[in-house]
């Protein structure tokens, strides 16, 4: 029939819905409104998806779930009198005198409006998880938060297993009653209570609304606790690690919180729903009307069908849940929503060799002994590519991959990074910049765009910084144009002459060996090992130094390692780093110390890759808890995550150089993890794979 079926989640809501339906009918509003009884917002969402109901108003978190799990969309938004359009902002407040930042929250005392409340819990906790600051194992968010902060007041957390920590700062009412209640009995409950918790020194940070500080300071508050408070004594924590004045909430917040919205199926004519409700609000939203759309007083409840503070309903232009929620809130929800019942009991790790199987088996046992979740299972495959296939086919869940394999995993198999490896800052062999080094020469200076016809020095054929990245970058930029996918010939024709040591010189263009010198006796010319004096990154730099070549493609550390007395070999002993420069992609030249801004690409760290439907926060949560126990190579807990010496191998499961597993943060895609320059170089090379 021609009706819109509204889903009610309780008896009072059903009652109000019936009255709204009747009021609309009497006013001749078309189409007619019918009421369907659901048991909860979740149930209503299921009824709508199954076409047994058509519409319901939801909060941000529920809109996220409804959109992600059922493809529902928001079509009508609520606007509130006191707020900023269709939203408000979640902020983190600290005392101006403190030194806390968003990056130093671990261990501080925290004040929250209440458990599972939007700005007091969902947004800050979700944000901390999503940004990688807070790791959660096995979906146990409460445990993670209780371990993270140095005591909290989270009204309503008294019934949880972590009440000791989460209710530690709560104080109840003046007679000590109602400690940690999710009600006004707890003095630190709600927006003003959480702020009071901070103001009275119980906590170091309060998670509240953008207007909370200004509403409770500068003489605006009646209770005695707030009489003397000044807004200038408080500051906001910004996402970038800075702090700001409490009036700067538009720029400095954790997330913009979307208003509640009416959601419907993805193919529903949202305009029709808005016209129906608009007719209704035109007649039934003011004081004297027979039915009050935005009041729940008559039913002894609050916020039935719509929030009572709604001043009007507006149509939503871009009808997608992502657009309505906004990226900040969306990201926070991604971090927060983890359903323990849907968490797989196992994480199946892909292994590629007998030693790796052995190490993985030991890892599984070690993790199980420490009750880490999910449990590890080891599944073998023949190659990294085979791992990718098996992960895509849902036979395996995770594997650690190198840069080139991450590219394939993302591009061909749709996998995403869940965690990354982090190496020591001084470790340049595992994550480094690829640079083009030239002699500082004012009379014959040339740029990256003028390399044609120059002499080039390369570490070796197939080496990342010596071949793959520079050649890929030059192909991608259109300087080298291979015919019939013949990259070798194209490179040999692009440069006047080169030294590109190689192991299998069959059909190898002679000009790619023209600059090579072999060993001291002049033998082993152009071989792919250290017998060729111009082999490797040190050799490629030597090729430049000895004026055999005009440009050397090396790592960013190569110049430093071989100048200023760092290499005592005769060819390097007198070299000074300031005699060399880098060629930048923008056509400029730069000092060798400027490698971070002037490079062809950064070789990315290895990353753990998973299917896009895998909860990456549970993967990182597991690895983070595991590395606390097993990450130190000298730990006494019976297993070493980042050491393979016990298994007669190297770089098993993780690179041995790994210092920590790290969250991916905002680098949630293979392109994000690899970086645009590295991807461009790989795309240059892969465009030639015919």
């Amino acid at each position: 029939g021609m009706e819109v079926r509204w889903c009610a989640t309780s008896d009072p809501e059903q009652h109000k819905c019936g009255n709204m339906s009747e009021a609309f009918r009497e006013a001749g509003i078309q189409p007619s409104l019918l009421c369907v009884r659901g048991t909860s917002a979740d149930h209503c969402v299921q009824l709508i998806a199954a076409q047994e109901a058509d519409a319901i108003t939801l909060d941000g978190g529920a809109i996220y779930e409804a959109g992600k799990e059922h493809g529902l969309k928001p079509v009508v938004g609520e606007v509130y009198d006191q707020e900023v359009g269709t939203s408000y902002y979640a902020v983190a407040v600290v005392r101006r005198s403190s030194h806390v930042t968003i990056d130093t929250l671990k261990g501080v005392k925290s004040c929250h409006t209440g458990i599972n409340r939007t700005v007091g819990w969902n947004v800050p906790v979700g944000y901390l998880v999503e940004s990688g600051r807070l790791s959660v194992m096995g979906c146990d968010v409460l445990k993670a938060v209780s371990d993270y902060f140095g005591g909290s007041c989270v009204p309503g957390a008294g019934e949880t297993s972590y009440s000791e920590s989460l209710c530690r700062l709560c104080r109840g009412d003046s007679s000590g009653e109602g400690v940690c209640d999710k009600s006004p009995l707890e003095r630190y409950y709600d927006y003003s209570g959480a702020f009071r918790c901070l103001a009275e020194g119980a906590g170091d940070v309060a998670f509240v609304k953008h207007s909370t500080v200004l509403e409770n300071t500068d003489g605006k508050t009646l209770p005695s606790w707030g009489q003397a408070l000044l807004s200038q004594d408080f500051e906001l924590l910004c996402r970038d690690g800075s702090r700001a004045d409490v009036t700067e909430w538009r720029q400095c917040h954790l997330a913009r919180v979307p208003a509640h919205a009416v959601v419907v199926r993805a193919d529903t004519d949202g305009g029709l729903i808005f016209r129906l409700l608009n007719e209704g609000q035109r007649l039934f939203s003011h004081e004297g009307s027979s039915f009050q759309m935005f009041s729940s007083e008559a039913y002894g409840q609050k916020d039935l069908l719509f929030k009572d503070s709604t001043s009007e309903l507006v149509p939503i232009a871009t009808q997608t849940y992502e657009a309505w929620l906004g990226h900040e809130y969306l990201h926070a929800m991604k971090g927060l929503l983890c359903d323990p019942n849907r968490l797989p009991p196992y994480l199946r790790w892909c292994v590629l060799s007998t030693p790796e199987i052995q190490k993985c088996g030991d890892m599984a046992v070690a993790f199980r002994r420490q009750r880490l979740k999910p449990e590890i299972q080891c599944v073998s495959a023949k190659s990294p590519q085979h791992c990718m296939e098996r992960i895509q086919a849902e036979q395996v869940d995770a594997v650690t991959l190198s840069g080139e394999d991450i590219y394939t995993a993302g591009k061909t198999y749709g996998l995403v990074p869940a965690a990354g490896e982090h190496y020591a800052p001084e470790d340049s062999s595992n994550s480094y910049y690829v640079v083009a080094v030239v002699r500082r020469d004012s009379s014959h200076a040339f740029t990256l765009d003028e390399l044609r016809g120059k002499r080039s020095c390369h570490a070796g054929f197939g080496s990342p910084a010596g071949w793959d990245v520079p050649v890929g970058a030059l192909i991608q930029r259109g300087f080298i144009r291979p015919k019939d996918c013949d990259v070798l010939t194209a490179v040999s024709e692009f440069f006047n002459a080169s030294c590109v040591p190689v192991n299998n010189p069959k059909n190898y263009p002679s000009s790619l060996c023209a600059l090579c010198v072999g060993d001291e006796q002049g033998r082993n010319k152009c071989v792919g090992n250290s017998q060729e004096r111009y082999y490797g990154y040190r050799g490629a730099f030597r090729c430049l130094v000895e004026n055999a070549g005009d440009v050397a493609f090396v790592r960013h550390t190569t110049v430093f390692d071989n100048t200023n007395g760092h290499n005592s070999e005769p060819w390097a002993a007198e070299l000074r780093s300031e005699d060399y420069e880098l060629l930048c992609p923008n056509g400029a030249r730069a000092e060798v110390s400027q490698f971070a801004a002037c490079n062809l690409a950064q070789i990315p760290p290895h990353a753990v890759m998973v299917r896009p439907d895998t909860n990456i926060f549970t993967v990182y949560g597991l690895l983070d808890k595991a590395q606390d126990l097993f990450g130190d190579d000298h730990n006494k807990n019976g297993f070493k995550m980042f050491d393979s010496s016990n298994y007669h191998g190297q770089d098993l499961l993780f690179k041995d150089a790994t210092v920590r597993a790290v969250p991916v943060g905002e680098k949630t895609t293979y392109r994000g993890w690899l970086g645009l320059d590295y991807v461009a170089a790989l795309e240059g090379m892969s465009s030639q794979q015919c």
């Epitope: 029939g1 021609m2 819109v4 078309q30 189409p31 998806a49 199954a50 076409q51 058509d54 059922h70 493809g71 419907v264 199926r265 993805a266 193919d267 529903t268 004519d269 949202g270 305009g271 029709l272 016209r275």
Partner: antibody
């Protein structure tokens, strides 16, 4: 009885224009989304345009900027103005009603009107 | 754009048999899938929407199933009037796309 009757199909030269009409009856036209769907000579079905009950239009990239869909609520008529016609626009054009509340699932199809674009 | 891949392209069966036609979406479309039947020289008719809800007047021998990206239409005990071409279509959003069709012929 629900009826959708298309008209206006014809033989037209590439680059030419044509306006299709669809007369709707037997249902509350104002409250339903409507669409045009075409069927190519190879029998492939292709979505051409949709219009919500309130008049918001949606088009695929292949016809965007060339075709314009509109509706006349007073006369219960749907229109499709087709400009810059190409040979690949040759097809049987169906006027289709969206299901109740739905923009894109289609519960009633007219008999179609034939459009041939050829020099 | 979401691609809809239907299989098989054609199918021969006898009256009384049970047949299944499948449709795969190139990305998740939840349950937003419709099936249409078209007989020679006639307009298409809606059979199933929302992946498994039968349209008004459609016999119960037709049933739709699936969600996400994989869907199927099953016809139990084929009747003579069931022969024709079947199309799937997603109704998740724009652009709307159809499968290439499955021609069901009498063996």
């Amino acid at each position: 009885e629900l009826k959708l009757v298309e008209s206006g199909g014809d033989l037209v030269k590439p680059g030419g224009s044509l306006k299709l009409s669809c007369a709707a009856s037997g249902f509350s036209f104002n409250n339903y989304a409507m669409s045009w769907v075409r069927q190519t000579p190879e029998k492939r079905l292709e979505w051409v345009a949709s219009i919500s009950s309130g008049g918001t239009t949606f088009y695929p990239d292949s016809v965007k900027g060339r075709f314009t869909m509109s509706r006349d609520h007073a006369r219960n008529i749907l229109y499709l103005q087709m400009n810059s016609l190409r040979s690949e626009d040759t097809a049987m054009y169906y006027c289709v009603r969206g299901q109740w509340l739905s923009l894109y699932s289609m519960d009633y199809w007219g008999q179609g009107t034939s459009v041939t674009v050829s020099s | 754009d979401i691609q809809m891949t239907q299989s098989p392209v054609s199918l021969s069966a006898s009256v009384g048999e049970t047949v299944t036609i499948t449709c795969r979406a190139s990305e998740i479309i939840y349950s937003y899938l419709a099936w249409y039947q078209q007989k020679q020289g006639k307009s298409p008719q809606l059979l199933v929407y929302n992946a498994k809800t039968l349209a008004e007047g459609v016999p119960s021998r037709f049933s739709g199933s699936g969600s996400g990206t994989q869907f199927s239409l099953k016809i139990n005990s084929l009747q003579p009037e069931d022969f024709g071409t079947y199309y799937c279509q997603h109704h998740y959003g724009v652009p709307v796309t159809f499968g290439a069709g499955t021609k069901l012929e009498l063996k």
